[in-house]
Interface confidence: medium
């Protein structure tokens, strides 16, 4: 500790007094000492606070399990070692930069993970994608891209790692808008989704969401991604079918000014364009499970 | 792409009876829902009855208990059986077919064949 003396001045009350020297190392003490607490706690926080949520709770067991469990269910699918699946998912964003992602380092997964669905059976989705899937589900010959490997593995999580350590960020990952694009997620979406569009052939089936203000939303992954990366020359037709979300809603939202938009840019691109409304989504379904029902040839 | 032609059309007396045909060809290896459809002059195009792949079956309130219809899937064909004829009966009748929307949404089905003239004079 500093030297303290004592010395008595008016009145009988001690008083502590430091010598220049003491002072000016007890500053410089304290200065280390906040220094030391920025560096350790502060630093580290701010390198890493990003806008969006973190890499999901048990992320790297999560992808190992789903790819094992999607490799028992598809014959096709099981010559997939999933050790090496996570290790080359890992690989594509471990100790990067986590808003430098290219789709280049999803390559080694593209590859392993390459898969044969047919070309005519797919169905594609916009901000609808629950539906999309209870469709798929029941209609077990049609695919969106989450019934692929790939998209099995991802689907609702989120993932990113921190530049030059081998950790991952399980407090915060980057915002696509507040951050930056090229982060590991949104990166990983647009490599398979672009994959899966260039694949499709024939008639081409999307649904979107009726009740949203934009029904077809140029930003969304089908807007920016998928509707770009149909090949004309394999792909006959887009159809769009629009899910109403109102029972009492039997406009033509066909008629929609986003959907005469996506008219446009698929016929643009020598692409035929249908569309139809999807009035009764419930009904849908079901009829679909059960197209016996008498029920099923009134108006859905 | 799937073509439909229908056939059977013509001309009739006031409750007499008629067979419309339709046949499918092109690509029918999916379970296509069919139906039929009549647009009467000056008149919007409305449901008639429809079939599903498997059997099941639906008829507009007006024709109940008089029209028929069914289907033979070998023959990829679709067949509605006119009984007790009216007047108001007469239209052109257009067989239609869908993949998934299971009719009767007359914008939004995906086949449609060119039609035939029902007359029925009283």
């Known amino acids: 500790m500093a030297n303290c003396e004592f010395s008595p001045v008016s009145g009988d009350k001690p008083c502590c007094r430091l010598s220049r020297r003491a002072q000016l190392c007890l500053g410089v003490s304290i200065l280390v000492l906040i220094l030391v607490v920025v560096l350790a706690v502060v630093v580290p926080r701010w390198r890493q606070q990003w806008s969006g949520p973190g890499t999901t709770k048990r992320f790297p067991e999560t992808v190992l399990a789903r790819c094992v469990k999607y490799t028992e269910i598809h014959p096709e699918m099981r010559h997939v070692d999933c050790q090496s699946v996570w290790d080359a998912f890992k690989g594509a964003f471990i100790s990067k930069h986590p808003c430098n992602i290219t789709e280049e380092d999803y390559q080694p997964l593209m590859k392993l993970g390459t898969q044969t669905v047919p070309c005519n059976k797919i169905l594609l989705w916009s901000r609808i994608k629950d539906l999309a899937h209870q469709f798929t589900q029941v209609q077990r010959d049609m695919f969106t891209l989450e019934d692929t490997l790939l998209g099995y593995l991802a689907d609702d999580l989120t993932w990113c790692g921190e530049f030059n350590t081998s950790k991952i960020n399980y407090q915060s990952c980057p915002d696509w808008r507040k951050d930056c694009s090229n982060n590991p997620v949104s990166v990983f979406w647009k490599t398979v989704s672009r994959r899966f569009a260039e694949a499709a052939c024939d008639v081409v089936h999307v649904m979107l969401n009726g009740s949203r203000s934009k029904i077809f939303d140029k930003n969304s992954t089908f807007g920016s991604v998928e509707v770009h990366n149909l090949q004309p020359e394999k792909v006959q037709t887009l159809e769009a079918w629009v899910i109403h979300g109102g029972r009492e809603d039997s406009r033509d939202l066909c008629q929609d000014p986003t959907i005469k938009e996506l008219e446009s840019i698929i016929s643009k691109r020598n692409i035929q364009f249908s569309c139809k409304n999807i009035y009764r989504p419930d009904k849908f379904l079901q009829c679909v499970k059960n197209p016996e029902d008498s029920s099923c040839t009134s108006e859905i | 792409q799937v073509q439909l032609q229908e056939s059977g059309g013509g001309l009739v007396q006031a409750g007499g009876s008629l067979r419309l045909s339709c046949a499918a060809s092109?690509?029918?290896?999916?379970?296509?829902?069919m139906g039929w459809f009549r647009q009467a002059p000056g008149k919007e195009r409305e449901f008639v009855s429809g079939i599903t792949w498997n059997g099941g079956t639906s008829y507009a309130d007006s024709v109940k208990g008089r029209f028929t219809i069914s289907r033979d899937n070998g023959k990829n064909s679709v067949y509605l059986q006119m009984n007790s004829l009216k007047p108001e009966d007469t239209a052109v009748y257009y067989c239609a077919a869908d993949r998934f929307t299971l009719v009767p949404t007359t914008s939004d089905l995906d086949y449609w064949g060119q039609g035939t003239q029902v007359t029925v004079s009283s």
């Open positions: 092109g690509r029918t290896d999916t379970r296509y829902t």
